[in-house]
């Protein structure tokens, strides 16, 4: 719980705490934000990203975002609050302890995305289909 | 009774370097990851650093990055805070903090040591 010598400011999001007053630490994630990448038509890959930041805000979950055009491929690894949409799209997956790619309609481009909630877990990207059973076009390919 | 005390805060001037100590007692400490955070007057809490229970490796905010240090001695269940380059922003009460076991929460917290940082 928050103890009383820790003050609980107006609008004070940095204190962030669960049904029984507990205080939520934040979260440890991969933050390079956006750089090229050679990770390509594989099951997963690595970020190389060698930075690990103490997320500013606790409720901010790890996000990673793959996208690929005619010129380049890049890889962005960042914090963001689950509550909040980015690239225009929400972080259905926060709660997970991978960071399982799944694919985002984007034109001009190949542009893929996950989030999750356990240390540097956008470290790891998973594009394997294997873990992406929750995509129901997968799932008739699987089963037929 | 898990207890955690911190030490070494006091009046230092800009550019100046201070060591905060954390005395941990009541738990095994070679298990927990521990944290710093700090609370400027009148502001939100800020996570300044974290150490691993294993293999010491160590995390920090933007803000503390290359000024500030976290370290650990295990047989003295001791957790410190090298702080150098110290500016007038860096004026809050620091708490340090022990993880849970469930590694979702913070349980336990020091009573907080005040770093003054002023000319």
């Known amino acids: 719980t928050i103890p009383p010598h820790v003050q609980k400011s107006v609008n004070n999001d940095m204190i962030v705490t669960d049904n029984n007053g507990a205080v939520k630490f934040p979260q440890l994630c991969k933050f390079c934000d956006v750089r090229f990448s050679t990770c390509d038509n594989q099951k997963s890959c690595m970020s190389n990203c060698s930075i690990t930041s103490i997320c500013e805000k606790p409720q901010e979950v790890c996000v990673a975002v793959w996208r690929k055009n005619d010129e380049n491929i890049t890889l962005e690894t960042v914090c963001h609050d689950p509550k909040l949409p980015y690239h225009d799209f929400i972080l259905e997956d926060a709660a997970s302890p991978k960071c399982i790619m799944k694919e985002k309609k984007k034109p001009g481009e190949t542009f893929f995305m996950c989030s999750c909630s356990s240390d540097e877990c956008n470290d790891n990207i998973i594009f394997s289909e294997e873990y992406n059973t929750s995509n129901p076009d997968l799932l008739l390919v699987i089963f037929q | 009774e898990v207890q955690l005390l911190e030490s070494g805060g006091g009046l230092v001037q800009p550019g100046g370097s201070l060591r905060l100590s954390c005395a941990a007692s009541g738990f095994t400490f070679d298990a927990a990851r521990m944290w710093w955070a700090r609370q400027a007057p009148g502001k939100g809490l800020e996570w300044v650093s974290?150490?691993?229970?294993?293999?010491?490796?160590?995390y920090y905010a933007d803000s503390v990055k290359g000024r500030f240090t976290i370290s650990r001695d295990n047989s003295k269940n001791t957790l410190y805070l090298q702080m150098n380059s110290l500016r007038a922003e860096d004026t809050a009460v620091y708490y340090c903090?022990?993880?849970?076991?469930?590694?979702?929460?913070?349980?336990?917290w020091g009573q907080g040591t005040l770093v003054t940082v002023s000319s």
């Open positions: 974290a150490i691993a229970d294993i293999g010491n490796t160590t």
């Open positions: 903090a022990k993880q849970s076991g469930s590694e979702d929460h913070f349980d336990y």
